[in-house]
């Protein structure tokens, strides 16, 4: 598994660091997450041709991944800080069910899964400290989360494989948005 | 070959219109983040805007904001600039170019720029 | 926008000489940052990214170092062919460069 985020060795070096903003942490957690996240799809790309299949294949998968629209503010145009951070959180936590799915898709990186879970909780509870309306976010019901599990679950193996690339993708291309986003607040 | 050609350049008169293609081979645009940068003639490298494959999220530049847009059709697998309200100061060779799949990102892959001259 | 400023503008020296040019962020921009070569009537080509990382088939001549707000290029023993313009680019928010540094012979 990768450093975890905090202090990495450019950091240590510097004994009179100011200790990290909140922004800066949130930034950190985001990008570690991220390298998590690219160790998984090798593993993914390297085991099966999902990675080579394009993107209209894919979409027509019917998982319902959560993805950034115009409406959620979080573009430079129609920005709306808190619109944003609204769904940025809420879309995390509706990826953890997915997070959840891959912990047993990996051999050799099973760590890594763990971590991109693991550090993807704590995400959620950095930005939802930064946010103002908690009340606006919506938590996946518990119930229908545990019958998608279920039914990911019972995929045969060539979908569970798509599933897999699937998720990576979708949520690296989440964080990534969110990055972008997070930096004009 | 993975490539970037631009096209569309020329002469315009202040307060005009232009649309800048940048075509893609070799790879996919809607699996990559692309960006304009443009250089004034004997001038440095201004970054103009890009565009962030997944849903399409544009950035631009306080110097084109509400002037230029950015957009692409993925079947053309093609990228293009629409600059309006041109001013002379927008006179520049503009490339097209790639950002990197990495975070943090640079630029992997340059165009070989289509030259913009605005004068009446 | 995030400003980029690059120091010296202008830079004279010999072959074999050690060089630096600086770059200075606005804002902290963290290891989000790339340097660029620029020959005239050529398009940019990358050197360094991440602050630090040597592009592949890049001369080990070339190093780059800082994180935050300052970051510094280095060439140890410059060649014929260094002689060239320099650009620093961020990616944190936006890409915007550095005004340039001309390295002329002196």
């Known amino acids: 598994a990768p450093v975890p985020p905090g202090e990495d060795s450019k950091d240590v070096a510097a004994p009179h660091r100011q200790p990290l903003t909140s922004s800066e942490r949130i930034d950190k957690q985001i990008r570690y997450i991220l390298d998590g996240i690219s160790a998984l799809r090798k593993e993914t790309c390297n085991k099966s041709n999902m990675c080579e299949s394009s993107k209209e294949a894919l979409a027509e998968n019917n998982l319902n991944l959560p993805k950034m629209a115009e409406k959620d503010g979080c573009f430079q145009s129609g920005f709306n800080e808190e619109t944003c951070l609204v769904k940025i959180i809420t879309g995390l936590l509706e990826f953890e069910v997915y997070l959840e799915y891959l912990q047993n898709r990996f051999e050799s990186s099973e760590e890594q899964a763990r971590a991109v879970q693991m550090s993807t909780k704590v995400l959620i509870q950095f930005l939802q400290k930064k946010a103002k309306n908690l009340d606006a976010i919506t938590t996946p019901d518990p119930t229908t989360n545990a019958s998608l599990l279920t039914k990911l679950q019972a995929q045969n193996q060539w979908l569970q494989d798509m599933t897999t690339h699937l998720i990576l993708r979708s949520f690296k291309e989440f964080l990534q948005s969110s990055l972008r986003a997070l930096r004009q607040m | 070959e993975v490539q970037l050609v631009e096209s569309g350049g020329g002469l315009v008169q202040p307060g005009g219109s232009l649309r800048l293609s940048c075509a893609a081979s070799?790879?996919?645009?809607?699996?990559?983040?692309m960006i304009w940068v443009r250089q004034a003639p004997g001038k440095g490298l201004e970054w103009v805007s890009d565009?962030?494959?997944?849903?399409?999220?544009?950035y631009y530049a306080d110097s084109v904001k509400g002037r230029f847009t950015m957009s692409r059709d993925i079947s053309k697998n093609t990228v293009y600039l629409q600059m309006n309200s041109l001013r002379a100061e927008d006179t520049a060779v503009y490339y097209c170019?790639?950002?990197?799949?990495?975070?943090?990102?640079?630029?992997?892959?340059w165009g070989r720029g289509t030259l913009v001259t605005v004068s009446s | 926008d995030i400003q980029m400023t690059q120091s010296p503008s202008t830079l004279s020296a010999s072959v074999g000489d050690r060089v630096t040019i600086t770059c200075r962020a606005s804002q902290g921009i963290s290891s989000w940052l790339a340097w660029y070569q620029q020959k005239p009537g050529k398009a940019p080509k990358v050197l360094i990214y991440k602050a630090s990382t040597l592009e592949s088939g890049v001369p080990s001549r070339f190093s780059g170092s800082g994180s935050g707000t300052e970051f510094t290029l280095t060439i140890s023993s410059l060649q014929p062919d260094d002689f060239a313009t320099y650009y620093c680019q961020q990616s944190w928010l936006g890409g915007s460069f550095g005004q340039g540094t001309k390295l002329e012979i002196k």
């Open positions: 070799g790879f996919t645009i809607s699996s990559n983040y």
């Open positions: 565009l962030y494959y997944y849903a399409g999220d544009t």
């Open positions: 170019a790639r950002w990197a799949d990495d975070h943090p990102p640079w630029i992997d892959l």
